[in-house]
């Protein structure tokens, strides 16, 4: 059976605040839990949703959450449905409303000495307590001539007289919170001796050095007094004007005229009317100086034909709010049609090529006018002036492929080689007109090239095949100086390529023929056994029909390759003693010997007093130190080859003889003793 571990319970809740109706069930099998409100299923919303099996309220709503909630658990296997206890919210709320006239039926019926009843339309639960205000001052119950009924939310004035005139507002508070009237009621009961507003001054915005006029009139019996004050409470009269209001004139009808208005004249002007009886009436109006800022720049715009686009003109900050309009070719745009103005936007519907040009956004107010141009380009699909052609380009020379197109705006041209985008580098350059230059054509440049010309309106493309006309060349060029080992077999290769397969032959530079033990086999010079006489200058000649011939000169040297007669050995030396590393090499030409110690070449001219390299190639190091330890390499080289051999040098401390050892004890390892 389904058992409720936690059941929802009725509770207080605050309007707009969080709440949770708990429900937890236990059953032998899986159960589905859902909620009912007044018997109807509760659908999840962002405001009210199931949280596990409980029902969560992000913000309680007094209208949507009033009623009885019930948690229902359903076991689909057994079919059992169990319902929790009912739960409801006692929702506390308060809601503002206006102050309205309850009695008499209309304002027109209000006369001195009649009863006037006002009602405060603030409602709430629990019922709030009310406080009434006249012109912002609290009215306490039991004051003369008025009574407050909290139950009916009414304020009754009996009888109502001119002294009750004013702005009536109310506030209410309860356990939930506080609210004040959303709309207040102005009670006006005439007393001839009270000043009454006939004409109130209005806020004025004027341009600098223009004139400003404030109108102000009161009526009363006897006539009331009228006085103008500027911000700092300085009175303004025709006899005593403050220094910064020298150009102010007060007319007999109460109007105030300011001429040649400057920034220091901006501010609040107060017109005060005082009747024989009653309070003074203070009316305020502000004088603002008109201003207009600069407009932000437009980025040029590129649109495509047939589309609909909008350009928004942000009006500059200004006072009064600047009016905005768009012009094209000196003509103001209409508010409907195909190209028109909508609000601050320029709208171009079904754009045509003829719509391209300069459009101007104008903004103006009393302070002046500002304008900003936007350049509109209508993009067209590129068209061909010259397509790339299948071309034969000569190897090693610059090659050109044209891709000449025209469109608005200027089209962007990109090139592809074998479907791969060509990025400009030292070999490829794309000119402004779209032509591709291959700086030094190579054999493998012979492939497909495709150019694509694009604008926002679309793109066109064409491809061409490049055939490279190979130059006659050695591949690779033979080394100009080569060595052959005496009494050994040797080969000197020579190969070339061209538009046609070239014929290759060798000859001696002096024109003499090759000896019988030297053969020329398809460009490879073969010496069966090198003799001293084989040294000399040779020429490899490559030729074909269309391209003629080319020559490569090679000087062959016959040499006895280097061998070491004496090689340095692993050496251990006491610190402070002298180390000798021997090295002797032979060969023809006679090899030179260099030493490398600790990974750097030992320069004989910079060795210092401790090191010396002998004529025979041996290296001597005097007064050795631990830092001299390491591998030493003897390098023997001549113009034909190079060979090296290495050995380690160990520098050790001299041992202190122990008493047990006799004077003739041998050292613990093989040493050089000097």
């Amino acid at each position: 059976a389904i058992v409720f571990i936690k059941q929802p319970s009725s509770q207080d809740a605050l309007q707009g605040r969080r709440a949770l109706l708990r429900c937890e069930v236990e059953a032998p099998g899986p159960v589905h839990v859902y909620w009912l409100l007044d018997g109807a299923p509760v659908q999840d919303t962002e405001r009210r949703f199931a949280q596990g099996s409980s029902l969560s309220f992000a913000a309680v709503d007094r209208l949507q959450d009033s009623g009885t909630f019930q948690c229902v658990a359903r076991d689909d296997v057994t079919g059992e449905e169990a319902r929790s206890a009912n739960a409801s919210f006692n929702i506390k709320w308060i809601e503002a409303g206006p102050v309205v006239l309850k009695h008499p039926a209309s304002e027109a019926e209000i006369q001195p000495q009649t009863q006037v009843t006002l009602r405060c339309h603030i409602d709430g639960h629990p019922r709030p307590t009310y406080q009434w205000f006249r012109d912002g001052t609290p009215l306490s119950d039991g004051q003369s001539n008025h009574t407050v009924s909290s139950k009916e939310r009414n304020l009754t004035l009996r009888p109502a007289g001119p002294e009750h005139s004013g702005l009536y507002s109310c506030c209410a508070h309860s356990a939930f919170g506080q609210a004040c009237s959303s709309q207040n009621f102005t009670l006006s009961i005439a007393d001839e001796s009270f000043a009454r507003v006939v004409l109130a001054p209005q806020d004025v915005v004027v341009a600098r050095y223009e004139e400003a006029m404030f109108h102000c009139q009161f009526s009363a019996q006897p006539p009331p007094s009228l006085q103008w004050l500027f911000e700092d409470e300085t009175p303004i009269t025709n006899r005593s004007r403050p220094p910064h209001l020298r150009r102010a004139t007060v007319f007999a009808n109460g109007s105030l005229l300011l001429t040649q208005v400057r920034p220091r004249n901006a501010g609040i002007y107060r017109c005060i009317g005082q009747g024989q009886r009653g309070p003074p009436i203070i009316l305020e109006a502000t004088l603002h100086l008109a201003e207009i800022e600069d407009m932000p720049l437009f980025e040029p715009r590129v649109f495509t034909a047939g589309s609909e686009e909008r350009v928004t003109c942000l009006p500059p900050k200004g006072l009064p709010e600047p009016s905005v309009w768009w012009e094209h070719a000196g003509v103001r745009l209409p508010t409907h049609g195909r190209v028109y103005q909508k609000g601050h936007e320029l709208v171009l519907a079904n754009i045509a090529e003829s719509d391209a040009g300069v459009y101007t956004c104008h903004a103006a107010n009393l302070a002046g006018q500002r304008r900003q141009d936007v350049n509109i380009t209508v993009a067209t699909v590129p068209s061909w002036l010259k397509k790339p052609q299948d071309s034969q380009l000569e190897e090693g020379k610059p090659g050109y492929l044209d891709c000449l197109t025209q469109a608005t705006p200027k089209p962007t041209v990109v090139w592809y080689r074998n479907q791969m985008l060509i990025s400009e580098d030292s070999r490829f350059e794309v000119f402004k007109n779209g032509t591709l230059r291959i700086n030094s054509v190579e054999v493998y440049d012979g492939t497909w090239y495709r150019c694509m010309s694009s604008t926002p309106a679309g793109s066109i493309e064409a491809q061409a095949r490049v055939q490279v006309l190979e130059k006659l060349k050695f591949t690779p060029p033979p080394q100009p100086q080569q060595c052959m080992e005496f009494d050994k077999e040797a080969t000197v290769p020579c190969s070339a390529t061209g538009r046609e397969k070239p014929t290759i032959k060798w000859e001696r530079a002096d024109g003499s023929s090759l000896p019988e033990w030297v053969t020329d086999n398809a460009g490879t010079l073969h010496f069966a056994r090198v003799t001293r006489d084989d040294a000399g200058n040779y020429t490899c000649i490559a030729s074909n029909g269309p391209q003629g011939q080319i020559r490569a000169h090679v000087q062959l040297t016959v040499a006895v390759f280097i061998t070491f007669k004496v090689e340095p050995e692993r050496t251990t030396v006491y610190q402070g003693h002298t180390a000798l590393l021997q090295c002797e090499a032979q060969g023809d030409p006679k090899p030179l010997i260099q030493w490398k110690g600790k990974d750097r070449i030992l320069d004989p001219t910079k060795l210092g007093p401790r090191m010396h390299i002998f004529q025979n190639g041996s290296l001597v190091i005097h007064d050795v130190a631990p830092e001299d330890s390491g591998r030493y390499t003897c390098i023997a080289g001549n113009s034909c080859n190079i060979k090296h051999t290495e050995a380690p040098l160990y520098v050790v401390d001299k041992p202190v003889p122990e008493e047990s050892e006799g004077p003739g004890s041998p050292p613990p390892y093989k040493m050089i003793q000097t």
Epitope: G29, P30, L36, G39, A40, P41, V72, R74, D75, D76, V77, T78, G79, E80, E81, A82
Partner: antibody, heavy 113, light 107 residues
């Protein structure tokens, strides 16, 4: 002991109507969801309709929606299935089930001209 | 709608064999799955609910496992009275759907 007995089956022409009943005993009928399930001859089981304990929630298979109506009378411990606009493919044994743990023996509905 | 696919559709086995039937759901149904046994001319009988809980009175040789989309019914040692058709059904969402059934026959 839970008992479910279906009745009301029989032969009916295409386009005709039938009302099936299911008499329940041996459990608190008003606290349980009830279901109708059918099985065409030689075929598998097909769920038809469900009704919650107080008829708040009612569900139908797409194949019968708009033609069949499930209802219950908790005072009489009875479940009903009103079948209108019957088709040949509605021919089946109709079972009434308490949830899905206890089933009646079924009643055969044959729709044929 | 959630589709349930049973495999195999037919199964031949001998008494004492261990038999496994699989039910695959087209979307996650948590553990809201039941298994039935039906013999010819009879109403289906509930064997397993909540994917793995044995219904009261059902022999312990029947067991269920799985959750999400993969479920199995296992009969550890087949008895003569177990030759029948077995159905799975999901109780996760409406419409309630059944597998097409697995018929267990004597080899």
């Amino acid at each position: 002991e839970v008992q479910l007995v279906e009745s009301g089956g029989g032969l009916v022409k295409p386009g005709g109507s039938l009302r099936l009943s299911c008499a329940a005993s041996g459990f608190t009928f008003s606290s349980y969801i009830m279901n109708w399930v059918r099985q065409a001859p030689g075929k598998g089981l097909e769920w038809v309709s469900s009704i919650s304990s107080s008829s708040t929630f009612i569900y139908y298979a797409d194949s019968v929606k708009g033609r069949f109506t499930i209802s219950r009378d908790n005072a009489k411990n009875s479940l009903y299935l009103q079948m209108n606009s019957l088709r040949a493919e509605d021919t089946a044994v109709y079972y009434c089930a308490k949830g899905f743990d206890y089933w009646g023996q079924g009643t055969l509905v044959t729709v044929s001209s | 709608d959630i589709q349930l696919t049973q495999s195999p559709s037919f199964l031949s086995a001998s008494v004492g064999d261990r038999v496994t039937i699989t039910c695959r759901a087209s979307q996650d149904i948590s553990s809201y799955l039941v298994w039935y046994q039906q013999k010819p001319g009879k109403a289906p009988k509930l064997l397993i609910y909540a994917a793995s809980t044995l219904q009261s009175g059902v022999p312990s040789r029947f067991s269920g496992s799985g959750s999400g989309t993969e479920f199995t019914l296992t009969i550890s040692s087949l008895q003569p009275e177990d030759f029948a058709t077995y159905y799975c059904q999901q109780l996760n969402t409406y419409p309630r759907t059944f597998g097409q059934g697995t018929k267990v026959e004597i080899k």
